[in-house]
């Protein structure tokens, strides 16, 4: 166990031009906080995805309105540092997302509004125990300086917060079995300490704060003998003793999700469902209210206005979960047509369109032939996002204004043949089809394998292009 | 992606007329060969007549100097006067749709006509 600490030093305009307007003014004064999440692991998720390490809020910091005319300063920060404590191992590799929020203190209905000014991510290798590393970090034309660290909560000690060290009980040397704890030589390695009721007689333990049963035994305490009556549970191995399987710990035993929160078991750990009021990895942050801006991603609080009253988040599109923390991904439904590529913009969903298709989903197919002329006689076909023109007899380009072969094009459909001819252009078509250029199959179903000439046509006459 | 829906079928006499249309979406008439098919039960689906994207008209035998097919461009729309209807033009009628850039084809969904008395 131990404690994840964050110091915010500045957040202000970064280096070079085009510095950001101010995010306070005189009619609209606010002030800002931070948020952190971490998760474990070099990882590439998404900023929505769970703050499996755990997550924190900063105190609000002073208000600030914006002098008129002057540049926008550094702007004054909240005191104190952010703490996200863990309760397992510190992974060494880690996540990080930093939000920076601003409040705005008009007078808007329904209290204070928050949004979001700038979000930093990251990832970094960290020991526990080492030194405050610094950090700077830029988002569109802001910058954030910030330090932390990782430190172990006593008795846990070591880089990953796993080793437990204990005062030694005798001046010369540790107890029988015990190391020293480097580096604190005047304490010793202490027993692992198994979850707390953890039965002494038939559980054990190879990780702090775990019960694991020895053969026969049960239960997230290890309490519960397993009769050959009850062999119902798939999970673990056979029983020699017992014929029964017997259930190796899963991760909901013993409910980790504290305040009456439910488990759920997920292919990797256990997911908690918290109540109203209560949140992060295990319920454990209680007592949050409106006043603690627990809604993300601009979500609109109401109610809770003291710790023992629920709070609601009304989230803005493209946000949802009880906090607003989850991003919907609205392109996961693919809503644009025709081939075009979809952008969540958070706010609003966009669709770039494919060349001749628009609209908002690019479901207008665009007529390209609009204001466009085709010479010698020529008829603007569209499509494709490029007008083209059909031209008459002897005329060929984009525009008909070259001379050319008018079979060139083919212009018959379905395999009919193409002729120049004085007084047009001819297709003669395939057994099967009719029309000016072979276009309409007789019988679709099966137009080829049709004898020849079907009773009352004759297909294979040519049918003049006038 | 052309869309083509029909409307206008429905019972008629002997000797009596309708008028089949078929609203075009995705891209303009115009620039189309339409034509309307039909599909008697048991039997394979048949052309009746179409119209090129330059105007010219083809027609099968059976209903030549009874059945006109037609565009509006402006409604952008395509349509099938049937009279002096007979039994045998009992069927689905469907639109089709041919476009000359992709050369691909595209279907309605079709509409009832049936002729009795």
């Known amino acids: 166990a131990g404690v994840f600490e964050l110091q915010i030093h500045s957040f202000g305009p970064g280096p070079g031009p085009g510095a950001p307007r101010s995010p306070c003014s005189a009619r609209l004064p606010c002030r800002l906080f931070f948020r952190v999440c971490l998760k474990p692991g070099l990882s590439e998720e998404a900023a929505e995805s769970p703050c499996a390490l755990g997550a924190a809020l900063s105190a609000r910091g002073p208000v600030y309105t914006e002098q008129p005319g002057a540049p926008a300063p550094d702007l004054p920060l909240p005191d104190g540092l952010l703490q996200v404590p863990f309760r397992d191992a510190w992974p060494g590799t880690f996540s990080f997302i930093i939000e920076t929020w601003r409040e705005e203190l008009g007078d808007q209905i329904g209290g204070p509004a928050w949004s979001l000014l700038a979000r930093v991510a990251g990832r970094r290798r960290l020991a526990a125990g080492g030194p405050w590393a610094r950090d700077i970090q830029r988002a569109g034309a802001w910058e954030l300086r910030f330090s932390y660290r990782a430190r172990c909560e006593p008795p846990a000690v070591g880089t990953a917060c796993t080793r437990l060290c204990r005062p030694r009980s005798a001046p010369s040397r540790c107890g029988p079995g015990l190391r020293p704890c480097a580096p604190l030589e005047d304490e010793c390695e202490a027993p692992l300490v198994c979850r707390a009721g953890c039965s002494p007689e038939h559980g054990f333990c190879e990780q702090p704060g775990e019960c694991r049963c020895l053969e026969g035994w049960t239960g997230p305490l290890c309490t519960v003998p397993v009769s050959t009556s009850s062999c119902l549970s798939p999970r673990g191995p056979s029983s020699a003793t017992t014929g029964c399987l017997v259930p190796g710990p899963g991760p909901c035993d013993g409910n980790p999700c504290a305040n009456g929160g439910s488990c759920s078991e997920t292919p990797r750990s256990f997911e908690c469902t918290c109540p109203r009021g209560f949140y992060g990895l295990r319920c454990e942050v209680s007592g949050v209210t409106c006043a603690d801006g627990p809604c993300f991603n601009g979500g609109l609080c109401v109610g809770g206005a003291d710790p023992d009253s629920a709070y609601i988040c009304h989230c803005p599109p493209g946000f949802q979960g009880s906090n607003c923390e989850k991003r919907v991904d609205r392109c996961s439904l693919q809503p644009c047509r025709n081939g075009g590529l979809c952008l969540d913009l958070g706010h609003a969903l966009r669709c770039r369109c494919r060349a001749g298709f628009a609209g908002p989903r690019c479901e207008h197919d665009l007529d390209d032939c609009a204001g466009r002329a085709c010479a010698n006689g020529g008829t603007c076909v569209e499509g494709g996002g490029a007008h083209r023109c059909s031209c008459a007899l002897g005329f060929g380009g984009r525009d008909c204004r070259e001379r050319a072969d008018p079979c060139a094009a083919r212009p018959c459909a379905h395999g009919g043949r193409c002729y120049a001819h004085f007084s047009g252009l001819v297709c003669a078509c395939a057994p099967g089809y009719m029309g000016a250029r072979c276009e309409f199959p007789v019988h679709p179903d099966g137009a080829s394998a049709l004898p020849a000439a079907p009773p009352g046509l004759r297909p294979g006459d040519p049918q003049r292009y006038l | 992606e052309v869309q083509l829906v029909e409307s206008g079928g429905g019972l008629v006499q002997p000797g009596g007329s309708l008028t089949l249309s078929c609203a075009a979406s995705?891209?303009?008439?115009?620039?189309?060969?339409m034509a309307w098919y039909r599909q008697a039960p048991g039997k394979k689906r048949e052309l009746v007549a179409g119209i090129s994207a330059d105007g010219s008209t083809a027609y099968i035998d059976s209903v030549k100097g009874r059945f006109t097919i037609s565009r509006d461009n402006a409604k952008n729309s395509v349509y099938l006067q049937m009279n002096s209807l007979r039994a045998e033009d009992t069927a689905v009628y469907y639109c089709y749709a041919y476009r000359w850039t992709t050369r691909r084809t595209y279907w309605g969904q079709g509409t009832l006509v049936t002729v009795s008395s």
């Open positions: 995705g891209s303009s008439v115009s620039n189309l060969s």
